[in-house]
């Protein structure tokens, strides 16, 4: 066994950048650092077979599967799949190690196998074996967090039954409003499950996996603030575990906090309370109100009372399936080509929503915003004064919701214009749809001012991709018309547009554009 | 079905007095909090007094001292008594219980 080379398995990731896709170099793009595969002797095997470790690849990931060789002397090698021989071309590196590499572009199912790497040096020959298999994404969940109390312990547990395993975290943050966007500085994250300090104004638990991310923010009721005009709700399915935070600050401790549902107060068993004095000596009360498992009959009125702050109340309500709520009627707006406009979804849902905004069969982003009224609202801005049909989609794990909107530009027509042997066509999409005269010039009209009403047909079309409507207008060529120039003209409300047009014998068309 | 109703809105002088009242039908009325609110024109409404069904109030501050809360749970009537009106005042009260709300009364200080 002296004779065996030192063997190195690496698997590299590489990040796509669209440059590189499609040429296949030995390093085609930026790349994670390697990721040691081992490659240990394969026992009972005839022969000396090294194994990698199995290596799991999203679809479309692009990675090189790479054997470094510690052994004197020069190398040869050949890489066997699925019974086909692929070219193998060994380089040394600076420390003089045999490199050997296999790149796979955009992984697909067809690329998933065992990849056989046959190496002979100048001592020995070996072969190293790779299975790659695509990860099974399908089976990926990302659910959003829950809290359970921690037993004995006055902390909350976030919980979030996810595959992978998620990473949690908390995202704590101590001032009001708007300070506490995600990338303030007020913002404190906690990579940890339990979480001990409570008394923060905002709270909320993250989980991320390779799905994404997914928050649930503990809902507080704060009766230092002054009573909000709108009652807070909260929506939970039936069987969700239901927190809510009542917090008060007050001079001294001479004050108590209580939770009642409808009048009635709550059981012990579903509430906890916890006090600190804050830095400037004043006494911190929270009180919690759980249910682990919610039922319909824990639909109501929660109210938080104090001796020394004004009630304040929030309406839990306990649905059987989650919904999306709002209008989806169609939705036609006209602007001009200069104006300021945004299109808005304003929608009550629960779990919250993942939606997204198409403009001509290509995707947006789609951000929410929380407003007062329980209701929240998206916005989309960045159609950069393209007309035509865009659609708002929302779903959640119960719900689907689609909307459409319709954009037009009111803009003065433009006009193209075509001619084939019998007929010409001109073309415009301004907006409101113009109307269309055609005239014809000679020599007793030079300005073509003669009017033609024969044989003109005119008819609005969608033009598919954008969803906008296009006019158009076509002339059936008569003997009358035929070798003069004739003039059709497009106008609305924001002007009027024209092209000239020689109607001669077949062949390539002179157009004139004349506005 | 629960509904509020405001009365005892009008015109007064500045330094003036007025009493307003919020009736309540449809709901168990004494074992409920009440709070009035106030919207003055071009203005978000904004929260003014809270009586608890333990008799406690609480005031905003720009009416603490001139304003005070009262509740008769015989009549099913919770009162605003507002003394040493200002032009401030100004405003259309509302009461509230829970997610309920009156249709308002307006109150008109002059100066």
């Known amino acids: 066994n002296q004779d065996l080379p030192v063997i190195k398995c690496v698997l590299i990731n590489h990040k796509n950048n669209d440059s590189s896709v499609g040429k296949s170099s030995s390093y085609p793009m930026v790349s994670e650092s390697p990721e040691d595969l081992g490659c240990a002797l394969r026992p009972q095997s005839s022969g000396t077979v090294y194994e990698a470790a199995a290596v799991e690849v999203d679809v479309s990931a692009s990675i090189t599967l790479q054997v470094l060789v510690d052994a004197p002397g020069n190398i040869s090698c050949l890489w066997v799949f699925k019974h086909s021989s692929l070219n193998c071309q060994p380089h040394f590196d600076l420390q003089n190690r045999g490199v050997v590499s296999m790149v796979i572009l955009k992984m697909t199912e067809t690329q998933a196998g065992e990849y056989l790497l046959f190496i002979q040096s100048e001592a020995t020959n070996y072969t190293i074996l790779f299975t790659v298999s695509i990860r099974n994404t399908l089976l990926y969940t990302l659910r959003r967090p829950y809290f359970r109390k921690m037993e004995n312990q006055d902390a909350l547990v976030c919980i979030s039954e996810s595959v992978p395993e998620p990473i949690v975290e908390w995202v704590l943050c101590d001032s009001q409003g708007e300070s506490c966007k995600e990338e303030s500085p007020a913002v404190v994250k906690k990579e940890e499950k339990v979480l001990h300090e409570l008394f923060g104004t905002d709270i909320r638990c993250c989980a991320r996996n390779e799905l994404g991310r997914e928050c649930t923010r503990l809902f507080t009721i704060d009766l230092n603030q002054t009573p909000q005009t709108t009652l807070p709700q909260l929506f939970l399915k039936v069987g969700e575990p239901l927190w809510i935070r009542c917090k008060a600050v007050h001079v001294n401790h001479g004050f108590g906090l209580t939770w009642e549902l409808e009048n009635k107060a709550l059981e012990e068993g579903n509430y906890f309370e916890m006090s600190t004095y804050s830095t400037n000596r004043t006494m911190i009360r929270i009180l919690f109100a759980f249910v682990s498992s919610v039922a319909r009959n824990d639909t109501g009125y929660y109210t938080c009372s104090s001796s020394k702050h004004p009630s304040q109340s929030a309406l839990v309500t306990i649905v059987e399936k989650g919904f999306i709520n709002a209008t989806n009627s169609s939705e036609d707006y006209e602007i001009d080509q200069y104006e300021e406009f945004c299109f808005s979804v304003r929608f009550k849902a629960y779990p919250q929503i993942r939606c997204t905004w198409t403009f001509s069969r290509k995707s947006f982003p789609c951000e929410q915003k929380g407003l007062d009224n329980g209701y929240s609202i998206s916005k989309f801005c960045n159609h950069k004064h393209q007309p035509g049909e865009y659609i708002f989609h929302a779903e959640n794990d119960d719900a689907q919701f689609t909307k459409m909107f319709t954009l037009n530009i009111r803009r003065k027509p433009q006009v193209l214009a075509e001619a084939s042997a019998s007929q010409a066509s001109c073309f415009s999409d301004g907006y409101p749809l113009p109307s269309w005269t055609w005239k014809k010039c000679s020599d007793k009209s030079p300005n073509c001012t003669e009017e033609i009403t024969e044989g003109v047909w005119n008819r609005k079309a969608n033009r598919k991709v954008f969803g906008q409507w296009v006019s158009s207008s076509t002339l059936n060529m008569s003997e009358a018309i035929k070798g003069f120039l004739v003039k059709c003209c497009a106008y609305n409300s924001l002007g009027t547009s024209c092209e000239t047009i020689l109607l001669n014998s077949p062949g390539p068309f002179p157009f004139i554009q004349d506005n | 079905q629960v509904q509020l109703q405001e009365s005892g809105g009008g015109l007064v002088q500045a330094g003036g007095s007025l009493r307003l009242s919020c009736a309540a039908s449809g709901v168990t009325f004494s074992i409920n909090y009440i709070d009035w609110y106030r919207q003055a024109p071009g203005k978000q409404r904004e929260w003014v007094a809270q009586i608890t069904r333990d008799s406690n109030s609480f005031y905003a501050d720009s009416v603490k001292g001139r304003f005070a809360i009262s509740r008769d749970n015989a009549k099913n009537t919770v009162y605003l008594q507002m003394n040493s009106l200002k032009p401030e005042d100004t405003a259309v009260y509302y009461c509230?219980?829970?997610?309920?709300w009156g249709q308002g009364t307006q109150v008109t200080v002059s100066s």
């Open positions: 509230r219980l829970l997610s309920y």
